[in-house]
């Protein structure tokens, strides 16, 4: 799947993780589309 | 080590398409996004996007989403981008960065030159 | 999308000076800020991550502070190899973001 980004913002959340993807593990199931 | 190794520098006419490639070693390739970074002569840094080598998820910067293709070789550890319609001002050095979730961009490629020119 | 703007652009110094960079970044970005070094012609380098944490290598006379929307880079002691562009670069969104650079000069 692809993204564009720069037109939204997670800046406001709550949580104290960073809202970049986390790093790729085999697990990973593809996003549908 | 961790190493980003680049193609060579490319000369493009205007209109015409880049690739660049960047083949990792040191490090499991499908561990880490893969992003690309470009710097024009004498400006700072303007990110373009990134590939999950896995599942080929990409994050695009806007100003790009409509000429870059990220594409990603797990058999040879190699990540690509692919810019089209290159115009002068595309004019820039080139870079691919290992982005660590936590660490952000914590190994660069050295750099690919690509010079747009009639 | 968050704008991160540097000050100074500029700053002329000499070896031995302690110098700060600041980075103010237009809405909060938690910790996730970090520091590149570039020297000319080469790649930019990984000094500072997460607003303080020193990247693996990286000599502790730099030092990175700050949180929410107001970050600093400090060297507590200039080098003759410390002089040249550093750039602040948010890690906490997307899209990823770059100040547009500081350039350390030799005074």
């Known amino acids: 799947s692809e993204t564009t980004t720069g037109t939204s913002s997670n800046s406001s959340q709550s949580t104290s993780n960073s809202g970049l993807a986390p790093n790729p593990t085999n697990a990973t199931t593809k996003a549908a589309g | 080590q961790v190493q980003l190794v680049q193609s060579g520098a490319e000369v493009k006419k205007p209109g015409a398409s880049v690739k660049v490639s960047c083949k990792a070693s040191?490090?499991?390739?499908?561990?880490?996004?893969m992003n690309w970074v470009r710097q024009a002569p004498g400006q700072g840094l303007e990110w373009m996007g990134e590939?999950?080598?896995?599942?080929?998820?990409?994050y695009f910067n806007q100003k790009f989403k409509s000429r870059v293709t990220m594409t990603r070789d797990t058999s040879i550890s190699t990540a690509y981008m692919e810019l089209s319609r290159l115009r002068s001002d595309d004019t820039a050095v080139y870079y691919c960065a290992r982005r660590d979730y936590g660490t952000s961009l914590d190994y660069w490629g050295q750099g690919t030159t690509v010079t747009v020119s009639s | 999308d968050i704008q991160l703007t540097q000050s100074p652009s500029f700053l002329s110094a000499s070896v031995g000076d302690r110098v700060t960079i600041t980075c103010r970044a237009s809405a909060s970005i938690s910790k996730y800020l970090a520091w590149y070094q570039q020297k000319p012609g080469k790649a930019p380098k990984l000094l500072i991550y997460?607003?303080?944490t020193l990247h693996s290598g990286i000599p502790s006379r730099f030092r990175g502070s700050g949180s929410g929307t107001e970050f600093t880079l400090t060297i507590s002691s200039l080098q003759p190899e410390d002089f040249a562009t550093y750039y602040c670069?948010?890690?906490?969104?997307?899209?990823?973001?770059f100040g547009q650079g500081t350039k350390l000069e030799i005074k």
């Open positions: 590939i999950n080598p896995i599942t080929s998820d990409k």
């Open positions: 670069q948010q890690h906490n969104e997307y899209p990823i973001i």
């Open positions: 040191g490090y499991d390739f499908t561990g880490y996004h």
């Open positions: 997460a607003g303080s």
